[in-house]
């Protein structure tokens, strides 16, 4: 028998520095977690103790903090090289800055293979990107070889900016011939490493003949066997065992997100490459694990540029950006409109001639808007200003919801109106009229939404049975502020870009902004 240790991360999302327990900015260092310096300590400890170790990343290193905003992926290549990752799969967020934003900072600089079998380049890009990412890689590990095949969510064109010269194929269809090819190359131990979410990970384990282990990402799935060490609630045991269609037991793993855990899986193979046993658990990277001093020093060196960046002007406002709780928790506020407009703008993807865009709607809890921005400072808007407005380090995500769920969400928005509670929704691509004289749960008297399947966008009444795409904060997608109906009834959820980054990109693009209060939210009675 031959034993392999798989160390894995996924959805790190730019958390190079240690973070608080909820993966936001580290405040009290003695209680902080994760970060590449701490990760390196643990990885090195395991490499020294065990003979056959692979360090793998299942995608979405890009996007999530000011580190990515400033360094644009160069930080990912640098620190992943320093940690000596063995392979990485492409995630959807690796395309956030377009193909060039992937090629130059990461693909050309990484000293480890970057993989995806279901992304096919065409046209002029084919020769430019040739060899920079691979469908698979055969890695020598001790006296053996291990094949790693990569995959990426085929929804990437709707979630990011891969352009028109990359085709995202069905994962299973693309993986099978690569696995078959590996078998002709004498490779009898094969890991599928990819970024399509836990449901697809399980399908790959079930359907792709010859895959021995699946290491996934995208859905931020936390798996654990035994008592979990922090706040995350396990979605199942680690590893999650899938019985394949040809009768094999295939371990499937994922390691939550944000570099909070290091996935740790031990696999025992027989001489024919069959999995005999698999066990392990994610390792919580808490403060009991010291940060590696040399990596930490490097982080501090790279940090300097971030501090300079946060005070630089992104653009100007010529109007007061009203982000006060007195406005945003009670009525339409122009800060809410600005943020929603930025959220939609960030999701412009012309992937179908029938649609002017795949999504037109935004909702945003007023309680998530934490500060106004005064225009009387020469109109200057900085990252620092935006960090005061959006201090929680969240993301603006894409969900699919039925009209009936949206209606419930808008009822919830005003079910206890007047108490300055955070659930009051700011909107984009939506016209809502409330009648507060009616009883809670029946206050939405008009709800019109902007069409997507149209050449001239116009507002149509919401249809209860229709499925709509909506951009919203991850906080809402996860049921925050009492929006349990969103969490319970959403049909699809894909995590998006860092909230501040979305707004800062929009302001930089527009240069000068002047958002108005324009009648997106109306009240049919009372003095509003």
């Amino acid at each position: 028998a031959w034993e392999l240790t798989i160390l894995h991360t996924n959805d790190v999302h730019s958390r190079l520095e240690q973070t608080s327990e909820d993966s936001s900015k580290c405040v009290n260092a003695s209680r902080c977690m994760g970060g590449v310096a701490r990760l390196f300590t643990k990885v090195q400890q395991i490499r020294r103790a065990e003979p056959n170790v692979l360090l793998l990343d299942a995608g979405d290193q890009y996007q999530g903090t000011i580190w990515f905003t400033v360094y644009k992926g160069a930080e990912v290549a640098h620190f992943m090289n320093a940690l000596r990752y063995d392979a990485m799969a492409l995630g959807n967020h690796e395309f956030d800055n377009g193909v060039e934003g992937l090629i130059e900072p990461l693909l050309k600089e990484a000293k480890f293979p970057i993989l995806s079998a279901n992304i096919k380049a065409k046209g002029p890009l084919a020769s430019q990107i040739s060899g920079l990412y691979l469908p698979y890689k055969v890695l020598p590990v001790g006296d053996e070889v291990v094949g790693i095949v990569g995959y990426t969510s085929k929804e990437t064109p709707f979630l990011s900016n891969p352009g028109t010269n990359l085709v995202f194929e069905d994962e299973i269809t693309a993986l099978q011939p690569e696995v078959d090819k590996l078998k002709t190359l004498n490779v009898n131990k094969i890991i599928a490493l990819g970024h399509s979410g836990f449901e697809m990970d399980k399908l790959i384990a079930q359907k792709v003949r010859g895959v021995d282990v699946v290491v996934g990402g995208h859905s931020n799935t936390f798996l654990y066997t035994g008592n979990p060490p922090s706040k995350e609630v396990p979605a199942g045991k680690y590893p999650f065992i899938v019985t394949s269609d040809d009768g094999r037991k295939v371990p499937v793993v994922q390691a939550y997100a944000f570099g909070k855990y290091l996935g740790y899986l031990k696999i025992e193979f027989d001489e024919r490459g069959n999995v005999i046993s698999s066990h392990g658990n994610p390792i919580l990277l808490n403060s009991s694990i010291p940060e590696d001093p040399s990596i930490k020093a490097d982080i501090n060196k790279w940090r300097i540029k971030l501090d300079n960046y946060s005070t630089q002007e992104l653009g100007k406002t010529i109007v007061y950006l009203d982000g006060s709780s007195q406005s945003c928790r009670f009525r339409e506020c122009n800060m809410g409109n600005l943020i929603c407009d930025a959220m939609i703008n960030n999701n412009l993807r012309h992937t179908d001639e029938m649609f002017w865009n795949h999504v037109s709607m935004c909702i945003l809890n007023g309680g998530g808007i934490r500060s106004p921005i005064d225009e009387r400072n020469n109109g200057t808007i900085t990252w620092e200003n935006l960090a005061a407005v959006l201090p929680f380090g969240g993301t603006f995500d894409l969900v699919q919801l039925k009209g009936s769920t949206l209606k419930k969400a808008f009822e919830h928005s005003v079910h206890r109106y007047g108490q300055s509670t955070g659930e009051f929704l700011q909107v984009g691509g939506i016209h809502v009229v409330y009648d507060l004289s009616r009883k809670p749960g029946d206050r939405v008297v008009k709800l019109d939404v902007l069409c997507t399947k149209c050449r001239v966008p116009s507002y149509d009444p919401l249809k209860m049975d229709e499925v709509y795409k909506v951009i919203l904060p991850n906080f809402l997608a996860n049921g925050g502020d009492g929006f349990q109906m969103i969490k319970d009834e959403l049909l699809r959820h894909d995590s998006g870009d860092q909230d501040i980054n979305v707004v800062s990109t929009y302001i930089s693009k527009m240069k000068v902004i002047y958002p108005a209060v324009e009648g997106r939210i109306k009240f049919s009675t009372g003095s509003h």
């Epitope: 084919a126 020769s127 040739s130 469908p135 055969v138 020598p140 070889v145 094949g147 011939p177 078959d180 090819k181 078998k183 002709t184 190359l185 004498n186 490779v187 009898n188 003949r209 010859g210 024919r272």
Partner: antibody, heavy 120, light 110 residues
Framework: EVQLVQSGGGVVQPGRSLRLSCAAS????????MHWVRQAPGKGLEWVAV????????YYADSVKGRFAISRDNAKNTLYLQMNSLRREDTAMYYC?????????????WGRGTLVTVSS | QSVLTQPPSASGAPGQRVTISCSGS????????VNWYQRLPGAAPQLLIY???QRPSGIPDRFSGSKSGTSGSLVISGLQSEDEADYYC???????????FGTGTKVTVL
């Protein structure tokens, strides 16, 4: 010593069948993908077929698809090529070869070849 | 019929440098590695270069390989009389799901 010893070649009439064998020694046969390659008189090398280490995956050149079948017996350390419906253009020196681990298209060890002549 | 194109012949005096090209497409050399074989008269082919530029043990360092885009090349830097042979490039072709060989190049030592 790593060796591939071939047998089974000869003269055969068009439309008939022939089975080539390739006996392996000196290495763990069951760990290697195996290939057949041929060279017609005065022509270049032409790849014929490959079989994975466990026999589960087989690929063929278009020119032999549906007529030739590659197989292996790991217990006997032997590779086979069953050639049916032979044509004159199948006349060639046939080589068996082992694939290099992890490198597509790289054949590390070759047999000395066996001649197949298809003639009436 | 070969999918990879090589010049039919190449020659040089002893000690000279000879380069053989191998042209393919995105489905073979473009997405896979190039391998080179030497076939001496009356002998079975032997692997000369694998993985674009790697030499198996026992292959002299005067043989070197490289790949760029959808082409590969083999360089014999100090030609010797025993290098007179046929040389073939090869690669896996993803659209054919099989190996493809080059047309072959006959190297003559003058």
């Amino acid at each position: 010593e790593v060796q591939l010893v071939q047998s089974g070649g000869g003269v055969v009439q068009p439309g008939r069948s022939l089975r080539l064998s390739c006996a392996a020694s000196g290495f763990t046969f069951s760990s290697y993908g195996m290939h057949w390659v041929r060279q017609a008189p005065g022509k270049g090398l032409e790849w014929v077929a490959v079989i994975s280490y466990d026999g589960s995956i087989k690929y063929y050149a278009d020119s032999v698809k549906g007529r030739f079948a590659i197989s292996r017996d790991n217990a006997k350390n032997t590779l086979y090529l069953q050639m049916n419906s032979l044509r004159r253009e199948d006349t060639a020196m046939y080589y068996c070869a082992s694939g290099l681990t992890g490198v597509a298209g790289a054949l590390g060890v070759w047999g000395r070849g066996t001649l197949v002549t298809v003639s009436s | 019929q070969s999918v990879l194109t090589q010049p039919p012949s190449a020659s040089g005096a002893p000690g000279q440098r000879v380069t053989i090209s191998c042209s393919g497409s995105s489905s073979n050399i473009g997405s896979n590695t190039v391998n080179w074989y030497q076939r001496l008269p009356g002998a079975a082919p032997q692997l000369l270069i694998y993985n674009n530029d790697q030499r198996p043990s026992g292959i002299p360092d005067r043989f070197s390989g490289s790949k760029s885009g959808t082409s590969g090349s083999l360089v014999i830097s100090g030609l010797q009389s025993e290098d007179e042979a046929d040389y073939y490039c090869a690669a896996w072709d993803d659209s054919l799901s099989g190996n493809v060989f080059g047309t072959g190049t006959k190297v003559t030592v003058l």
